[in-house]
């Protein structure tokens, strides 16, 4: 029971974490204009991984995509890559972990297979979380460096921009979302790995005992009937599986993209 709870909780925590990583990656507020030196500006600038935006006092917001690949800093490209890798690994991890859930029975899948899948998804979640944390941290470091250098624009040289206004950028909401989401994914992955240990078939110190009866040789092995041999008319299994289907629906309905503009 504890194993199922740990596995289920790990899955849910990872799911929330990955949704957060996706949200952070799509958000435009990775860096926001620092208003400390210019609190009276009527034009507010903020930037994401994919575009930069300007919000005027009327509420009108104008966003421009970075329509160049080569003109962008290597660090920004690295952050993009880390976040995408984190999302991809997390998505695969989610897919694997759905089938690894103890409450979902698929064919005659052995507990050892479920344990392996749980471990695989756990590792994927851990790497996914680390990628997100690394990506956000690299970007934050880039911001701090640029802040103290008082650069006019974080992406200097992009599109032939003229450096005229001393606009300094500070941490945006996406960084905090990314850090929290990465942490949740990491925690979820650790929980999956812990659950994997409880799922693995226990090793026994005694050999299988053979009983000879009327010429038939039947071997009884401890725990040999743990895995279900199919759905059949097993209503209990069917009911549990239906529950799993609802979990899949929840995955599909979870917001995967947030537009904060």
């Amino acid at each position: 029971m504890a194993v199922t709870a740990c596995q289920g909780l790990g899955f849910v925590v990872s799911l929330i974490g990955i949704a957060g990583i996706i949200a952070a990656t799509c958000m435009d507020q990775w860096s926001t204009q620092d208003l400390y030196n210019n609190p009276v500006t009527a034009v507010f600038n903020y930037q994401g991984l994919w575009r930069s935006c300007v919000r005027e006092s009327s509420g009108f917001t104008e966003c421009r995509g970075y329509f160049t690949l080569l003109g962008l800093p290597a660090m920004l490209q690295a952050v993009r890559a880390l976040m995408i890798v984190g999302i991809v690994l997390g998505a695969i991890g989610l897919l694997v972990s759905i089938f690894a859930l103890k409450c979902i029975r698929i064919g005659s899948m052995e507990d050892s297979a479920k344990a392996n899948m749980t471990l695989t998804s756990g590792i994927m979640f851990i790497v996914s979380g680390l990628c997100a944390i690394a990506g956000v941290s690299v970007f934050a470091n880039m911001l701090v460096t640029n802040f103290w250098m008082s650069t006019a624009n974080m992406y200097t040289g992009m599109g032939g921009m003229v450096q005229t206004v001393q606009t300094r950028y500070t941490f945006g909401a996406a960084l905090f979302v990314g850090w929290v989401a990465g942490g949740l994914t990491l925690i979820g992955g650790v929980m999956m790995c812990i659950a994997c240990r409880g799922l693995a078939p226990e090793e026994t110190n005694y050999k299988a005992v053979s009983y000879h009866a009327s010429g038939h040789s039947v071997a009884y092995k401890p725990g040999g009937f743990k895995a279900s041999t199919g759905f059949g008319s097993n209503t209990k299994n069917k009911k549990i599986y239906d529950g799993g289907a609802r979990t899949e629906d929840e995955v599909q309905s979870y917001p995967s993209k947030h537009d904060y503009v």
């Epitope: 009276v40 034009v43 300007v54 005027e56 005229t164």
Partner: antibody, heavy 120, light 113 residues
């Protein structure tokens, strides 16, 4: 058609207060910020502040803090400006002006102005 | 506060002539985020409220004749009237739209000979 109709001229005594109005029509009142501008006779323009009718958020020119108070009434699509502790320096024409949505923070429609004369 | 300085304070021209008036700001009005200049030009005819002519330093407001042209960037801006008409008699103001408090220039009075 967008229209900003301001209240009539005011003649007030020094030390008194005056409240003028600016009724908006022809657009969604809560979607646009309203600015107020002062113009003394034969002189230039001076920005007083703005009010956002959507949430009643205000921003004032430091020079007019304590002097001007901006309010709005959604039901009548009207913004108000109250000037307190009036002196001869406050004798001017006061205009309300709508902040355009895509006009780079410029004011696209102006009221005809309310003339305030402070005299004993 | 950003100080807006307009020159000349007044000018007198004949109908059909080209007119240029200048506006200088104490700080740059160019926003780095979108590379747009936050400066507007207004026309105020006698006894009337100001009317928006140009915003974003160079974008003409709808309904404004194309003889009015705005140019410049950063701290130096220009309003040009390619062929002055009698109805252009007015005071022209430039305005800082970048930072609060919004500030106006002292105005350039255009007279027709």
């Amino acid at each position: 058609e967008v229209q900003l109709q301001q209240s009539g001229p005011e003649l007030v005594k020094p030390g008194a207060s005056v409240k003028m109005s600016c009724k908006a029509s022809g657009y969604t009142f809560t979607s646009y910020i309203m600015h107020w501008v002062k113009q003394k006779p034969g002189q230039g323009l001076e920005w007083i502040g703005y009010i956002n009718p959507y949430n009643d958020g205000t921003k004032y020119n430091e020079k007019f803090k304590g002097k001007a108070t901006l309010t709005s009434d959604k039901s009548s699509s009207t913004v108000y400006m109250e000037l307190s502790s009036l002196t001869s320096e406050d004798s001017a024409v006061y205009c309300c002006a709508r902040l355009g949505f895509t006009t780079r923070n410029a004011m696209d429609y102006w009221g005809q102005g309310t003339s305030v004369t402070v005299s004993s | 506060d950003i100080v807006m300085t307009q020159s000349p304070s007044s000018l007198s021209v004949s109908a059909g002539e080209k007119v240029t008036m200048n506006c200088k700001s104490s700080q740059s009005l160019l926003n780095s985020g979108n590379q747009k200049n936050y400066l507007a030009w207004y026309q105020q005819k006698p006894g009337q409220p100001p009317k928006l002519l140009i915003y974003g330093a160079s974008t003409r407001e709808s309904g404004v004749p194309d003889r009015f042209t705005g140019s410049g960037s950063g701290t130096d801006f220009t309003l040009t009237i390619s062929s002055v008409q009698a109805e252009d008699l007015a005071v022209y103001y430039c305005q800082n739209d970048h930072s609060y408090p919004f500030t106006f220039g002292s105005g350039t009075k255009l007279e027709i000979k």
